[in-house]
Interface confidence: low
Amino acid sequence: KKVVLGKKGDTVELTCTASQKKSIQFHWKNSNQIKILGNQGSFLTKGPSKLNDRADSRRSLWDQGNFPLIIKNLKIEDSDTYICEVEDQKEEVQLLVFGLTANSDTHLLQGQSLTLTLESPPGSSPSVQCRSPRGKNIQGGKTLSVSQLELQDSGTWTCTVLQNQKKVEFKIDIVVLAFQKASSIVYKKEGEQVEFSFPLAFTVEKLTGSGELWWQAERASSSKSWITFDLKNKEVSVKRVTQDPKLQMGKKLPLHLTLPQALPQYAGSGNLTLALEAKTGKLHQEVNLVVMRATQLQKNLTCEVWGPTSPKLMLSLKLENKEAKVSKREKAVWVLNPEAGMWQCLLSDSGQVLLESNIKVLPTWSTPVQP
């Protein structure tokens, strides 16, 4: 008995060939001996089976002695043994129809689980192997689960169902809903405008939901909601914004926030959450703000940074074109009685300057100038 595997929703063509290369009498039946279709001269006739409107043949092939049964929009319950009766002989074909579906939706939030469920006909014992877009292989039986979906899991998953040494391949497009970056850090001098961008790592036709930016300032004992907004068909509208600081928000995607100025009391880290319509859970992106201030008070030149800096970051004060006068893995450095000239405060990581602030120290009878 020949075995043919089909995919739910697809079309399958079961072949039946006569020895004579001409149009002769044939008919297809199911295992209950119910006629599905056949011919009467050059006409196609259909029987009373449940396949009625989904069954067809190719009349153009009859003259060559080929009498295929075409079943459209396959269902799991179409799995059966089909019998072609032609020239006093019977050809049996076992059709097994499988379906592979994602648990709820093919659009899943980062960190959520993907469950693929195999629908199979009674009596079958298939094995399934899926390959993710990043090349990860998972194997299983009726269900396969992948926990903690990552951004790289977005794309086409290719799953192979194996039964009776035959295989059928499914392709499922999974969209992992996430921000492009899990975390970002912005370095700014005091007073500078700060731009925060939250690009999404996916595109969908309609995007609706709501979001909020919570901010934990380094100086504050508790976090505070800085802004809440709605997203409707990719249009952003602000619902509520604190008055200090007053963030401005772009009206289109990508989500874009502007802090009018970087101030020490704003330095810290924020968490932007985005809840999408008809989705449980939220998208998250962490954003960090580091603020630098260089000041001269009397005979003390000080450089300070606020915000989440790593212990390996170096803070230095140097006179332009000279060696660093002071360099420490601390958040504040200072020089007593600095000589006149343009001083640079540098925040660097392994030699790479992340943030720089210049302050002009005038001869002792003048006041400092901050460019």
């Epitope: 604190t242 200090d244 007053k246 009018p260 020490p264």
Partner: antibody, heavy 121, light 111 residues
Framework: QVQLQQSGPELVKPGASVKMSCKAS????????INWVKQRTGQGLEWIGE????????YYNENLKDKATLTADKSSNTAYMQLSSLTSEDSAVYFC??????????????WGQGTLVTVSA | DIVLTQSPASLAVSLGQRATISCKAS??????????MNWYQQKSGQPPKLLIY???NLESGIPARFSGSGSGTDFTLNIHPVEEEDAATYYC?????????FGGGTELEIK
């Protein structure tokens, strides 16, 4: 302690402009927004707008945005408000105000004493 | 804009009694458990003075006879017991939405 010292009263003619000041002391001027509030004689309070002295960014009440222009001078710790094309409707006391810290950061905790502007021919 | 309606417009209360001032907002000023409503006192020829912030928090240096309550759209300022120096105009102000807006004021007279 935080103090906001405003300039003295102004008597101006209709159609003219006036510029008043608000000098801040007792805190880092560039760390906080300066707000301006209008109060007509015997009337309530109306928020005009605000300025971030650090960056110069300003925001206005849409109903009053063509009337006022807000500026700030970091070197003198002073915020300014200029009112243009004055009419009798602009005769009022104008206050500068600063919000508080921590819990009261969305309330006007500090106020200037007010500048009286009288528009009269 | 959010409209704040204060009542009564004026109020006369005997010394030592309770003064109650109401403020109704045209839409909720609550968000995430907080009410963004503040109360100010203004005496003639002086700037307003912050009494209560976030609906019920007493500003530093303000006597405990002042108290605020309410949430959503209905807020109340209570003064008990009223003292001579409390004669003034009282304003509510919302800070949840720009532009921030003030109520029309309630004038308190001490009998």
């Amino acid at each position: 302690q935080v103090q906001l010292q405003q300039s003295g009263p102004e008597l101006v003619k209709p159609g003219a402009s006036v510029k008043m000041s608000c000098k801040a002391s007792g805190y880092t001027f560039t760390d906080y927004v300066i707000n301006w509030v209008k109060q007509r004689t015997g009337q309530g309070l109306e928020w005009i707008g605000e300025i971030y002295p650090g960056s110069g960014s300003d925001y206005y009440n849409e109903n009053l945005k063509d009337k006022a222009t807000l500026t700030a001078d970091k070197s003198s710790n002073t915020a300014y408000m200029q009112l243009s094309s004055l009419t009798s409707e602009d005769s009022a006391v104008y206050f500068c105000a600063r919000k508080g810290e921590n819990g009261n950061s969305l309330a006007f905790a500090y106020w200037g004493q007010g500048t009286l502007v009288t528009v009269s021919a | 804009d959010i409209v704040l309606t204060q009542s009564p417009a004026s109020l006369a209360v005997s010394l030592g009694q309770r003064a109650t001032i109401s403020c109704k907002a045209s839409q909720s000023v609550d968000y995430d458990g907080d009410s963004y409503m503040n109360w100010y006192q203004q005496k003639s020829g002086q700037p307003p003075k912050l009494l209560i912030y976030a609906a019920s928090n007493l500003e530093s240096g303000i006597p405990a006879r002042f108290s605020g309550s309410g949430s959503g759209t209905d807020f109340t300022l209570n003064i008990h017991p009223v003292e001579e120096e409390d004669a003034a105009t009282y304003y509510c102000q919302q800070s949840i939405q720009d532009p921030c807006t003030f109520g029309g004021g309630t004038e308190l007279e001490i009998k």
